[in-house]
Amino acid sequence: KAMHVAQPAVVLASSRGIASFVCEYASPGKATEVRVTVLRQADSQVTEVCAATYMMGNELTFLDDSICTGTSSGNQVNLTIQGLRAMDTGLYICKVELMYPPPYYLGIGNGTQIYVIDPEPCPDSDF
């Protein structure tokens, strides 16, 4: 079954290559476990950036080598993606699945366009 997922249309990454956005879902069920996946769409290619499964009321746990971190509060997930460079600019889609118990629900957001601008290298100083 479809579930509504909302996320901001545009986010600008910081000069350190960090972008944060909120993914909010309208939960129609009483799930105890939720899976959140961030997908990146660029040039009609869709790739998985990161994913985490969490218990309602608990923290999200991404894999140790993941570029994502996050926290949850009710039906909101605060996602942070790190280590971004200009080449990572693209549409980042939030996918939410109510995993268990049944029934299963799936929601896919419209995506957040994340713009990443590589910082200008500092010019050498002559003293």
Partner: antibody
Framework: EVQLLESGGGLVQPGGSLRLSCAAS????????MSWVRQAPGKGLEWVSA????????YYADSVKGRFTISRDNSKNTLYLQMNSLRAEDTAVYYC?????????WGQGTLVTVSS | DIQMTQSPSSLSASVGDRVTITCRAS??????LNWYQQKPGKAPKLLIY???SLQSGVPSRFSGSGSGTDFTLTISSLQPEDFATYYC?????????FGQGTKVEIK
């Protein structure tokens, strides 16, 4: 490739105990709910128990509630079913199954025979 | 618990036949209905999930339809390897429950 391998079945007397294990590989084990489903000889499929991906929520069929305990060790990618106070009617092949939208992957099963 | 009733409990058919198996839920389960095939001595295998979605690797001669309480599994042209027992299962409300099975035999 997803693989589920059950072990621990065997012959046990009524009132006895047995612990089944299911070793999983080929997927992110902690992300998925897992279930035990059994099939008595010549009979249909019966759902027995389920556990959420984190292990925080467990569910049981009325027929085994209070006697069976499902658990998982996500660090070992292993699912367990502790079966106590076994009865003749618990005789069956026990399958572990990964549950996503459906039971999309099943183990080969392990036979539990309860008989004196 | 939701009861699942399959019909028929068994049927005889020939290779090439179109076969239809029905499954009825005791209350509405939307589209949370799955179909499995089981051969003797083997584990069940998922064929159709969410009423009509074909599981990866399953031949297109298998199809599913229905929603609410009434569902159908159709094999458009029965092949020798399709002789097996078929089960429906609802995943719309815990606990998961199965139909009693339909055995498809060679005529």
């Amino acid at each position: 490739e997803v693989q589920l391998l059950e072990s621990g079945g065997g012959l046990v007397q009524p009132g006895g105990s047995l612990r089944l294990s299911c070793a999983a590989s080929g997927f992110t084990f902690s992300s998925y709910a897992m279930s035990w489903v059994r099939q008595a000889p010549g009979k249909g499929l019966e759902w027995v128990s389920a556990i959420s991906g984190s292990g925080g929520s467990t569910y049981y069929a009325d027929s085994v509630k209070g006697r069976f305990t499902i658990s998982r060790d996500n660090s070992k990618n292993t699912l367990y079913l502790q079966m106590n106070s076994l009865r003749a009617e618990d005789t069956a092949v026990y399958y572990c199954a990964k549950r996503y939208i459906a039971f999309d992957y099943w183990g080969q099963g392990t036979l539990v025979t309860v008989s004196s | 618990d939701i009861q699942m009733t399959q019909s028929p409990s068994s049927l005889s058919a020939s290779v090439g036949d179109r076969v239809t198996i029905t499954c009825r839920a005791s209350q509405s389960i939307s589209s949370y209905l799955n179909w499995y095939q089981q051969k003797p001595g083997k584990a069940p295998k998922l064929l159709i999930y969410a009423a009509s979605s074909l599981q990866s690797g399953v031949p297109s001669r298998f199809s599913g339809s229905g929603s609410g309480t009434d569902f159908t599994l159709t094999i458009s042209s029965l092949q020798p390897e399709d002789f097996a027992t078929y089960y429906c299962q609802q995943g719309g409300m815990p606990p998961d429950t199965f139909g009693q099975g339909t055995k498809v035999e060679i005529k």
